[in-house]
């Protein structure tokens, strides 16, 4: 499945992943109760297809976005250039770190997700994107997410 | 198993300086973030400083700033601590993280 069209890097990180915490470096605004697996998608050109559904306010938001590669391995941009993105491997197996800055609700932000192809939680993979967060000058609190694999509007 | 060993603590006159090391082994170092941390008598431990794996990106607490400078060598697994300009409250054990885990720390004492 590994075409030259699509890129190593972008196969790697293809399929289901579990968002597993967050943070930012300011208070965002809607944070999610729940999420469903993060799917992402390669395409060809190198470019990936993100697709998530979050539970926020007892609604149910359906996000895809279209992450589009860069010269740079592991940096993408989305939103028409309004935000970067940068995919990048945790020390622990089977984890990724997604970093990303650009505009939210009109103001400039910067947030890191960790994301894990196993829905249970791993302390080192949670402990190392810690550290990674304050070597970013990431400093709100780490959001735990909770798991669903659909997303029910006015429950879990 | 995750092991992390820091080195080159000392006695130090004010205004003086002194690198730490931590050799990290056990995780693949070059792709795990890794911090400083202090301890001083009586007194909660405190982070110091971060580092991310390639070593872009660092970050300082703000009574370290401009004084401390946090490198690392990933093919040496080992990460840096440069104290320059110490001062008698920079008086702690320092110690090393990486992936949750915690060295044993080194012993820095800054008097006359």
């Known amino acids: 499945q590994d075409t030259p069209a699509l890129g190593k890097d972008t196969v790697a990180v293809s399929g289901k992943w579990y968002l597993k915490a967050m943070t930012a470096d300011q208070e965002v605004p809607e944070k999610p109760d729940s999420v469903t697996p993060m799917i992402l998608k390669a395409q060809k050109g190198g470019n990936l297809e993100a697709k998530i559904t979050m539970l926020t306010n007892g609604q149910c938001q359906n996000i895809t976005v279209v992450l589009h590669k860069t010269s740079e391995p592991g940096k993408y941009t989305a939103y028409e250039g309004q935000r970067v993105v940068f995919i990048q491997p945790s020390p622990v197996r089977d984890h990724y770190i997604l970093y990303c800055e650009g505009e939210l609700h009109g103001r400039q932000i910067r947030m890191a997700k960790l994301l894990g192809r196993d829905p249970e939680q791993s302390q080192e993979a949670l402990e190392d994107f810690r550290e990674f967060s304050r070597a970013k000058g990431l400093n709100q609190e780490i959001l735990e997410l909770a798991q669903s694999e659909t997303c029910s509007p006015g429950g879990q | 198993q995750v092991q992390l060993v820091e080195s080159g603590g000392g006695l130090v006159q004010p205004g003086g300086s002194l690198r730490l090391s931590c050799a990290a082994s056990?995780?693949?170092?070059?792709?795990?973030?890794m911090g400083w941390y202090r301890q001083a008598p009586e007194k909660e431990r405190e982070w110091v400083a971060s580092?991310?794996?390639?070593?872009?990106?660092?970050n300082y607490a703000d009574s370290v700033k401009g004084r401390f400078t946090v490198s690392r060598d990933n093919a040496k697994n080992t990460v840096y601590l440069q104290m320059n300009s110490l001062k008698p409250e920079d008086t702690a054990v320092y110690y090393c993280?990486?992936?949750?885990?915690w060295g044993k720390g080194t012993l820095v004492t800054v008097s006359s």
């Open positions: 580092i991310t794996g390639p070593g872009t990106d660092t």
């Open positions: 056990g995780f693949t170092f070059r792709l795990a973030a």
């Open positions: 993280r990486g992936m949750g885990y």
